[in-house]
C-alpha cells in the first residue's frame, strides 16, 4: 500500500509556530498576521511501527523539501536534526527508525516521541526564538505538547 501523508502545521501549547532557522534547524516563536506564512508545513506520513490506540507511528517531512526530522546520537545524547534524503525514495511506508515518531494524542494535544529513543520528545523552550529539540523530560519547563492544523495540499 502507498504511504499516506497529510500536510499540516504544528504549534506548541503556548501557540508558538515552527519556522526554519538556517537550512537544517527549526525554531519556535510567536507569529501573527502575514508572518504566519513563514511557518513550516509538514508532510506527516503514516508509517510502519509499533502501534496502539493512542500511539501512531509517523514521519515528519518538510513539505516539498527532501528533509525529514530524525533522531540520532550526537556526543552520546539523543538529538533532533533535519536530515536530507533522496526524494525518489521518500516517503515510504517502512521508514528507518530514526525518522519515526510515535504520535501520542492526549486531551486534544499531540506529543511526538522518538521511536529510536523512547521517552525523548520533540520539544520547544519557553523562551522565544529557540531551536526545536529532542528533550528527555515531560511536564517540566520545556514544552512537549502540540496542536495540529490541516493545510490544503
Amino acid at each position: 500500500a502507498p504511504v499516506r501523508s497529510l500536510n499540516c502545521t504544528l504549534r506548541d501549547s503556548q501557540q508558538k509556530s515552527l519556522v526554519m532557522s538556517g537550512p537544517y534547524e527549526l525554531k519556535a516563536l510567536h507569529l501573527q498576521g502575514q508572518d504566519m506564512e513563514q511557518q513550516v508545513v509538514f508532510s506527516m506520513s503514516f508509517v510502519q511501527g509499533e502501534e496502539s490506540n493512542d500511539k501512531i507511528p509517523v514521519a515528519l517531512g518538510l513539505k516539498e523539501k527532501n528533509l525529514y526530522l530524525s533522531c540520532v546520537l550526537k556526543d552520546d545524547k539523543p538529538t533532533l536534526q533535519l536530515e536530507s534524503v533522496d526524494p525518489k525514495n521518500y516517503p515510504k511506508k517502512k521508514m528507518e527508525k530514526r525518522f519515526v515518531f510515535n504520535k501520542i494524542e492526549i486531551n486534544n494535544k499531540l506529543e511526538f516521541e522518538s521511536a529510536q529513543f523512547p521517552n525523548w520528545y520533540i520539544s520547544t523552550s519557553q523562551a522565544e526564538n529557540m531551536p526545536v529539540f529532542l528533550g528527555g523530560t515531560k511536564g517540566g519547563q520545556d514544552i512537549t505538547d502540540f496542536t495540529m492544523q490541516f493545510v490544503s495540499s
Epitope: R4, N53, P57, K103, E105, N108
Partner: nanobody, 116 residues
Framework: EVQLLESGGGLVQPGGSLRLSCAAS????????MYWARQAPGKGLEWVSR????????YYADSVKGRFTISRDNSKNTLYLQMNSLRAEDTAVYYC?????????WGQGTLVTVSS
Amino acid sequence: EVQLLESGGGLVQPGGSLRLSCAASGFTFRDYVMYWARQAPGKGLEWVSRIDPMGSSTYYADSVKGRFTISRDNSKNTLYLQMNSLRAEDTAVYYCAKPEGNFDYWGQGTLVTVSS
C-alpha cells in the same frame, strides 16, 4: 474483512446541505481516529476532516471550516460528515478513511456534485 461504506452523496444546489455517512465493519471502530478526505476531478487528494476515537477532538481543512461538521456514533460504527453552505468547489468524491497506523482502510467513495 474490513469495510468502509460511504453513502449520502448526490447532486445539490450551491448553498445546500448534505449529510454523508460511513458504515464501518471488520475492525474495532471505536478505537480509531477517522478521517474524511475528498478528491475533486483532476485534483489530488485533500484531507477534509478528522475525529478522534471518542469524538472529542476534531480538525478541519481551512476550506471547509465553519461549514462542515464531522461526528461519529461508536454504538453504530458510523462516521458522519454534515456539509452545509455547499459550493461548486466542494464537488468531489468523498472518502471515509482510517489512514493512521500500519494498516490503512479506505471506502470506495461517494460523489458529491454541487451545481445549479
